[in-house]
């Protein structure tokens, strides 16, 4: 029986041009994690496999850095990478528990002050 | 065209060291894992390590972790595997292989160098 | 550690054939499975990993299926060049253990 549930830092928000840490937490089970998958809808971002080490996909090497832990640091954001991110743990011999974290990417207020106002 | 060059076949004597070189082209080298995997004659294959070229931080085989040394040198694009206190069981064809894009599988490989360990 | 079987261990097969191979896992290894082909003297080519995604070239009458602890790799319509041996491996824990192989052979 899966016991286990994932505490995730839920829906957050971050200027443009900055970073963000995604984090994931698993409690509640004494299943041993083998690995922890970090997802943005169907595209893979990252894999922390126990064994193993760290696979950051090639196509997001340059902007994503692994951890602290087994949570995901994104850099250099941009407005596109606003949506919807999942954290996969595969665990034995529960199964698989996954968390979903909601990334908005705002405008920084540089560039919004920048927008309206102009310098004499 | 993503392309790995090994270095030429090598004899040694047990209890000697072979370096075995892989240089790589065609792609962002720091960007993808390279990974050792050796083939004894006539048998299957056996996963020895994994190493970041960009970190240099490696992986390996519990089996070939008191032997094996993966290193990188990015100025030229390739990576090495020395093995340690070679044995006649170590002779094998042994291959580099780049790490997929999207898991620990292996999307493209050396075209192999064999070492052979004998007196 | 996980070990990777692989059945049959050979097989004799025509051209034309519908050839299936079968890849079982010691336990539950999800979709974390890719496919090789190895012909003598060369490197193995990657096939298929995560299961059932082709890799980038490779012919369509090559496909991957199944999840779990039990694999399958099915060449829909043999071809000359396809007779050759094939590997399973988990590729999501260390070793990353292969299986034994699959020798297709000219029947």
């Known amino acids: 029986m899966m016991t286990g549930t994932i505490e995730t830092t839920g829906n957050i928000s971050a200027e443009k041009g900055g970073s963000i840490i995604l984090q994931c937490h698993l409690s509640s089970t004494t299943a041993q994690v083998t690995q922890v998958n970090w997802e943005q809808q169907d595209q893979l971002l990252a894999i922390c496999n126990a064994d193993l080490g760290w696979h950051i996909s090639p196509s997001f090497k340059d902007r994503v850095a692994p951890g602290p832990g087994l949570g995901l640091t994104l850099q250099s954001l941009t407005v596109n990478d606003t949506g919807e991110y999942f954290c996969i743990y595969h665990t034995y011999p529960d199964g698989t528990y996954t968390g979903r974290i909601f990334l908005e990417v705002l405008e920084s207020s540089v560039a919004e002050h920048g927008a309206r106002f102009q310098i004499p | 065209e993503v392309q790995l060059v090994q270095s030429g076949a090598e004899v040694k004597k047990p209890g000697a060291s072979v370096k075995v070189s892989c240089k790589a082209s065609?792609?962002?080298?720091?960007?993808?894992?390279m990974h050792w995997v050796r083939q004894a004659p006539g048998q299957g294959l056996e996963w020895m390590g994994r190493?970041?070229?960009?970190?240099?931080?490696?992986k390996y085989n519990e089996k070939f972790k008191t032997r094996v040394t993966m290193t990188v040198d990015t100025s030229t694009s390739t990576v090495y595997m020395e093995l340690s206190s070679l044995r006649s069981e170590d002779t094998a064809v042994y291959y580099c292989?780049?790490?997929?894009?999207?898991?620990?599988?292996?999307?493209?490989w050396g075209q192999g160098t064999l070492v052979t360990v004998s007196s | 550690d996980i070990q990777m079987t692989q059945s049959p261990s050979s097989l004799s097969a025509s051209v034309g054939d519908r050839v299936t191979i079968t890849c079982r896992a010691s336990?539950?290894?999800?979709?974390?499975l890719a496919w090789y082909q190895q012909k003598p003297g060369k490197a193995p080519k990657l096939l298929i990993y995560?299961?059932?995604t082709l890799a980038e070239g490779v012919p369509s009458r090559f496909s991957g299926s199944g999840s779990g602890t039990d694999f399958t790799l099915t060449i829909s319509s043999l071809q000359p060049e396809d007779f050759a041996t094939y590997y399973c491996?988990?590729?999501?824990?260390?070793?990353?253990?292969f299986g034994g192989g699959t020798k297709v052979e000219i029947k």
């Open positions: 292989a780049r790490e997929g894009a999207y898991g620990y599988y292996f999307d493209y």
């Open positions: 065609g792609y962002t080298f720091t960007n993808y894992w």
């Open positions: 491996q988990y590729h999501s824990g260390s070793p990353l253990p």
């Open positions: 190493i970041d070229p960009d970190s240099t931080g490696s």
């Open positions: 995560n299961a059932r």
């Open positions: 336990e539950n290894i999800y979709s974390y």
